[in-house]
Every structure is written in structure tokens, then in C-alpha cells.
């Protein structure tokens, strides 16, 4: 039961995470105009991975797509790539994990196959989450660098009569969505990997059995022999010898923590 719960929870957490990664990638507010210590402009600028927007105080909003590929900064392209790779891996992971779910029966799929699929999807979720976290972090680093550069510019060349409003950008909502979503996908992936251990049929599945020889109270414990060693072993037959194959409830699931920003 614990394996099913861990796997199911891992799937749900990953699903939420990947939905968040998709949302963050599509959001326009990756960077927003910094309003602190600025003259109050009646125009608010914000930028996403795909377009930049201007919201006037009148309520009118105008967005323009980045209609160039070569003219964009390499870092922005890298962030786009990381987010897309994260989404693609996550989507494939979700597809694989649906078939790997213990509660879903597809034909005569063996536990070992489900275990492998669970592990595969878990790894995919982990990589997907890492891609999203990396993408968001690269963008955040780019913002911090540009912020301090523009701050330095604000305090140079102010000697003239005419002043220009230096637009500085700070973290937008999409960054926080991306970090949380990446973290959730990562946690979901770890949970899937943990669940995989409980799904995998183990090589030695016997509990100690006591054989009472007449007149002696000596307990013999079967050592290192296997239930079936031949090729094409039928795991279904193992149940005959299985005095206590680990039940789903006995699998240990480790509590995981994530910080919500």
C-alpha cells in the first residue's frame, strides 16, 4: 500500500510541478520593472521569455513578441532551451509514469517492468526539475547582474539638466513559480525513485524458517540459494516459496521537504 501511495503521490506532485514549469515558461512576468527608489512612472514594463509587455496606468497593455532568434541574448536562448527540455522530459516522464502506476493494470505487465518504468519516469522528473531550476536561476542571475549595472549607471552622468528614467528590472512572479514548480517536479521524481525500490521483485524474498530436528533445538536458516536460477524464470511461481516477500506496507518512504517562496 505504501508503495502505491508513494508512487501515486510522486506522480501527482510531479504533475503539479510540470504544470507549474509550463505556466512559468509561458508567463510574461519573468522580470518586472523595479519601482523602488524610482520616479513613479505611469508605465509599467515587464518581460517574459517570449515577449515584453508595457502596461499603462490607463489599463491599456501592449505586448510585443521577440520576433528575432539571432538578435536575442545567448543567456535568454539558454533559459528557453532549459525550460523546453524540462517540459519535454517532464511530459515524457508523465506519460511513462501513467503506465507505471501500480493502481493501473495494463495487460500482463510484470512488476519488474513497472519498477523500471517508475525509475525511468522518476529520473526524468528529477532532470526536468533540475532543468527548470537551472533555467530560472540563470535568468535570475542575469537579472541581478543587469540590476547592479543599471544601478551604477543611474548614479553616473546625472550632472545635466535633463534626466532620463533608468528602467531597472527585478524578479518577476514567473521566477518564483518556476523555482517552486522545479522543486515539486524534483521531489516527485525522488518519490518515484523511492517507490521503484518497493516495486522491484527482490532476489531473496524469504523470512527465516525454523526447522526443528528431533531432539535438538537448532534452528537452520536457509542461506544464499535462489528460488529459481534458470533462464526465463517465472516470478509467478515465487509466491509458492515466499514466506514473507516484502509487502507494499513495509516499504519505507522518506519524508521530503520543500520550501515555498
Amino acid at each position: 500500500m505504501a508503495v502505491t501511495a508513494c508512487q501515486g503521490l510522486g506522480f501527482v506532485v510531479s504533475l503539479i510541478g510540470i504544470a507549474g514549469i509550463i505556466a512559468a515558461t509561458c508567463m510574461d512576468q519573468w522580470s518586472t520593472q523595479d519601482l523602488y527608489n524610482n520616479p513613479v512612472t505611469a508605465v509599467f514594463n515587464y518581460q517574459g521569455l517570449w515577449r515584453s509587455c508595457v502596461r499603462e496606468s490607463s489599463g491599456f497593455t501592449e505586448c510585443r513578441g521577440y520576433f528575432t532568434l539571432l538578435g536575442l541574448p545567448a543567456m535568454l536562448q539558454a533559459v528557453r532551451a532549459l525550460m523546453i527540455v524540462g517540459i519535454v522530459l517532464g511530459a515524457i516522464g508523465l506519460l511513462v509514469s501513467i503506465f507505471a502506476l501500480k493502481c493501473i493494470r495494463i495487460g500482463s505487465m510484470e512488476d519488474s517492468a513497472k519498477a523500471n518504468m517508475t525509475l525511468t519516469s522518476g529520473i526524468m522528473f528529477i532532470v526536468s526539475g533540475l532543468c527548470a531550476i537551472a533555467g530560472v536561476s540563470v535568468f535570475a542571475n542575469m537579472l541581478v547582474t543587469n540590476f547592479w549595472m543599471s544601478t551604477a549607471n543611474m548614479y553616473t552622468g546625472m550632472g545635466g539638466m535633463v534626466q532620463t528614467v533608468q528602467t531597472r528590472y527585478t524578479f518577476g512572479a514567473a521566477l518564483f513559480v518556476g523555482w517552486v514548480a522545479g522543486g515539486l517536479t524534483l521531489i516527485g521524481g525522488v518519490m518515484m525513485c523511492i517507490a521503484c525500490r518497493g516495486l522491484a521483485p527482490e532476489e531473496t524474498n524469504y523470512k527465516a524458517v525454523s526447522y526443528h530436528a528431533s531432539g535438538h533445538s537448532v534452528a537452520y536458516k536457509p542461506g544464499g540459494f535462489k528460488a529459481s536460477t534458470g533462464f526465463g524464470s517465472n516470478t509467478k511461481n515465487k509466491k509458492i516459496y515466499d514466506g514473507g516477500a516484502r509487502t507494499e506496507d513495509e516499504v519505507q518512504s522518506y519524508p521530503s521537504k520543500h520550501d515555498y517562496v
Partner: antibody
Framework: EIQLQQSGAELVKPGTSVKISCKAS????????MNWVKQSHGKSLEWIGN????????NYNQRFKGKATLTVDKSSSTAYMQLNSLTSEDSAVYYC???????????WGQGTTLTVSS | DIVMTQSPSSLTVTAGERVTVGCKSR????????????LSWYQQKPGQPPKLLLY???TRESGVPERFTGSGSGTDFTLTISSVQAEDLAVYYC?????????FGSGTKLEIK
Amino acid sequence: EIQLQQSGAELVKPGTSVKISCKASGYSFTGYNMNWVKQSHGKSLEWIGNINPYYSNTNYNQRFKGKATLTVDKSSSTAYMQLNSLTSEDSAVYYCARHVRGNSFDYWGQGTTLTVSS
Amino acid sequence: DIVMTQSPSSLTVTAGERVTVGCKSRQSLFNSENQKNYLSWYQQKPGQPPKLLLYWTSTRESGVPERFTGSGSGTDFTLTISSVQAEDLAVYYCQNNYIYPFTFGSGTKLEIK
């Protein structure tokens, strides 16, 4: 047809307060901010502030904070401006104007003449 | 507050003449993100409320004759009336629409000979 109909001229005593109304028709009232502008006799225009009728958010010109209070009544599509502690300096024509793209003001009320005199 | 300086304060022209009205801002009204200058021009005829002519420096409001054109960027702006008509007798105001509080120029009074 879009119209901003303002209340009639007011003659008030110094120290009192007055509430000017601006009834909007011909468009979605909550979809556009309403601005208020002061024009003293023979002088230029002065922006007082604006209000978002949907959320009732306000922006004031620092010079008019404490002097003007902007409110709206969504049910009657009417914007109000209350002017407090009136002095002769407040004698002017007050306009309401709709806020549109470019942060410009496309439709204006006909103006309300306020005269503060003892 | 951003001071908007208009010049000249008044001018008298004959019908058919070309007129230019200047407006200077103490601070740039240019928004780099959408490459637009947040400056509007208004026309106020005697006894009437102001009427919007141009916004974003050069975008003509619907119903405004083509003889009214706007130009400039950053801090220097110009309103041009290519061929003045008798009905253009009015006071023209420029307005900063970029930084709060929105401020207007002192106005340019156009008179027809």
C-alpha cells in the same frame, strides 16, 4: 455616444466643502480610469488625480492630497470629487476626463465652475 | 514634478500658414520597452473643454484632421499644423503622460490674423 456629464456650477463659502459629480454614459464605466483636472481662470491645466472605478484605486497629485478625495459609484456610473477646506485658490473650472491608451485623456466633461467666495 | 515648457506662449498667423509649437520636458518621456514617447497634445477652444489631438507624440486621435502632426523624442517635441484654418484658433497644450503627476505645458495661444 460617449458622454461625461458634470454637475452644475457651485458657489460656496471658504472653509466649506463641495462634491462635484461626473456621470459617464456610452461606454463601460469600470473599464477606464477617471481623471480630474483643474483649470484656474486663464491659466493652464493641473492634473488632480485619477481613480480606477473597478477597484476604486486612486492616484493623487501630491499637491492635492488632503484637498481632493476621489470616489465612484459603480451602480450609477458616476465619479465624484470632494474638495475640502475651500479657499479662494480653489476657485476654478474642474474637469473629469476618461483615461485611455497613451495615458492620454480622450473624452472630457463640460467642466464644473467652482467659485469660493464669502 | 516634471516641468513642461511650451514655446511660444502665443503666435498670430494667417490662414494657410504652417505653424510649429514646441514643448520641452525636464525629463525624458521615452519608454525604451515599447519605443514610445508618452506625450500628448490637446486643443482647447474658448469656453470648451480640452480636446485630445495626438498621443504617443505622433498618433492622431480619431477624427483629428491630418494637418495636425507631432514629432520629437525624449525631451523635445513639436506640434505642427501644416496649413492653419480659421477653426484652429485655440490654446494648445502638451502633456507628460509618463511620470506621475501628469503635467501640462503652460499653453500656446494661436491667433488668426
